[in-house]
């Protein structure tokens, strides 16, 4: 469960891939599309509002009666629109929605290497936002493998 309904903090940041491609958002036919692309030097990077929430693991999950605290995040590139996981289509979409946000809009934040993060679906543990064919997609990651695979790593820059 998410602790409280308010984020503990928020920040504006641009989102890029491990290979420094930018995540951009474009309004097309009254809906937003998400692109992964190389930006021209002079083009301004799109900013995303990251809202950080705390979430408790049920104590049964941790196996020893001790709750674990996770950091969860929602990502909003423009007012009233949030990134959401579509687990059926294995896709990441932008949807207009009102608060309280659906679970599909929440992602567990994983700090990875020095300056990289990953976003794990709250609704589907082991499934992460990743890059596939120049688009964002949901990618299943085997926990026994290295979670550092580059296609699920993102950089946040203020």
């Amino acid at each position: 469960s998410i602790t409280g309904i308010s984020p503990i903090t928020e920040s504006l940041a641009s989102l890029s891939t491990y290979n420094d491609q930018s995540i951009t958002f474009a309004l097309e036919d009254e809906s937003y599309e998400i692109y992964v692309e190389d930006l021209k030097k002079d083009k301004k990077k799109d900013k995303v509002l990251l809202s950080y929430y705390e979430s408790q693991h049920p104590s049964s999950e941790s196996g020893d009666g001790v709750d674990g605290k996770m950091l969860m995040v929602t990502l909003s590139p423009t007012k009233d629109f949030w990134l959401q996981a579509n687990n059926k289509e294995h896709s990441v979409e932008l949807h207009k929605c009102e608060k309280p946000l659906p679970d599909q809009a929440f992602f567990v934040l994983h700090n990875r290497s020095f300056n990289c993060v990953s976003f794990e679906c709250k609704t589907d543990p082991g499934v992460f936002i990743g890059v596939k064919d120049n688009h964002l997609a949901l990618i299943k990651v085997d926990y026994s493998e290295n979670l550092g695979s580059e296609n699920i790593l993102f950089k946040l820059s203020e």
Partner: antibody
Framework: EVQLVESGGGLVQPGGSLRLSCAAS????????LTWVRQAPGKGLEWVSF????????FYADSVKGRFTISRDNSKNMLYLQMNSLRAEDTAIYYC???????????????WGQGTLVTVSS | DIQMTQSPSSVSASVGDRVTITCRAS???VSWLAWYQQKPGKAPKL??????SLQSGVPSRFSGSGSGTDFTLTISSLQPEDFATYYC?????????LGPGTKVDIK
């Protein structure tokens, strides 16, 4: 109740080695990142090293890089700090601490051990 | 590396006083700043994380604020058990760095 208990400190000569241990209990050990922080006598706190829950790529302060190695054994709920080529300026109380969050280091460190004293002197 | 500075380095105050400690980062750390309290001979204790979130079990007279590079720890009404040294720490990027500490002692 979360418990972290450091051991392995003592007196060692300059250039010598020491291995610190931190025994953990009361939480799902492998889910949490851990860190070592030290405090020289009468001085402030200095971050030393960090390791993720899985034991992935560790991080070190410049002052110990190449001399200290952090590691963990998730099957034994143990954290270690191997300290080589010790110098007088490494004299300090060494604390181990666990991260607040299971998947992120952003929240700082919410549980600390009582510390173990390392004295480097001839 | 991100340098952390704290001011004042020490403050003398009386029980009931309002005490404010500031922490400045040499570059932005978003809100990923924690405050710790340490008493002589004891381990540090987490008071505030994410700049303004109160750690479980910490009295509400402690509060934190700020983002980016400038942060503040406030003790609204100093209690006898609050005489200690306070440290800020950024956990936005490696190497993690701590401020030099602010000692709060009895006037």
């Amino acid at each position: 109740e979360v418990q972290l208990v450091e051991s392995g400190g003592g007196l060692v000569q300059p250039g010598g080695s020491l291995r610190l241990s931190c025994a953990a209990s009361g939480f799902t050990f492998s889910s949490y990142a851990l860190t070592w922080v030290r405090q020289a006598p009468g001085k402030g706190l200095e971050w030393v090293s960090f390791i993720s829950g899985s034991g992935g790529r560790p991080f070190y302060a410049d002052s110990v890089k190449g001399r200290f190695t952090i590691s963990r054994d998730n099957s034994k709920n143990m954290l270690y700090l191997q300290m080589n080529s010790l110098r007088a300026e490494d004299t300090a109380i060494y604390y181990c601490a666990k991260s607040l969050y299971t998947t992120s280091w952003y929240g700082g460190f919410d549980s600390w051990g009582q510390g173990t004293l390392v004295t480097v002197s001839s | 590396d991100i340098q952390m500075t704290q001011s004042p380095s020490s403050v003398s105050a009386s029980v009931g006083d309002r005490v404010t400690i500031t922490c400045r980062a040499s570059q932005g750390v978003v809100s990923w700043l924690a405050w710790y309290q340490q008493k002589p001979g004891k381990a540090p204790k987490l008071l505030i994380y994410a700049a303004s979130s109160l750690q479980s079990g910490v009295p509400s007279r402690f509060s934190g604020s700020g983002s980016g590079t400038d942060f503040t720890l406030t003790i609204s009404s100093l209690q006898p058990e609050d005489f200690a040294t306070y440290y800020c720490q950024q956990s936005n990027s490696f190497p993690f760095t701590l401020g030099p500490g602010t000692k709060v002692d009895i006037k």
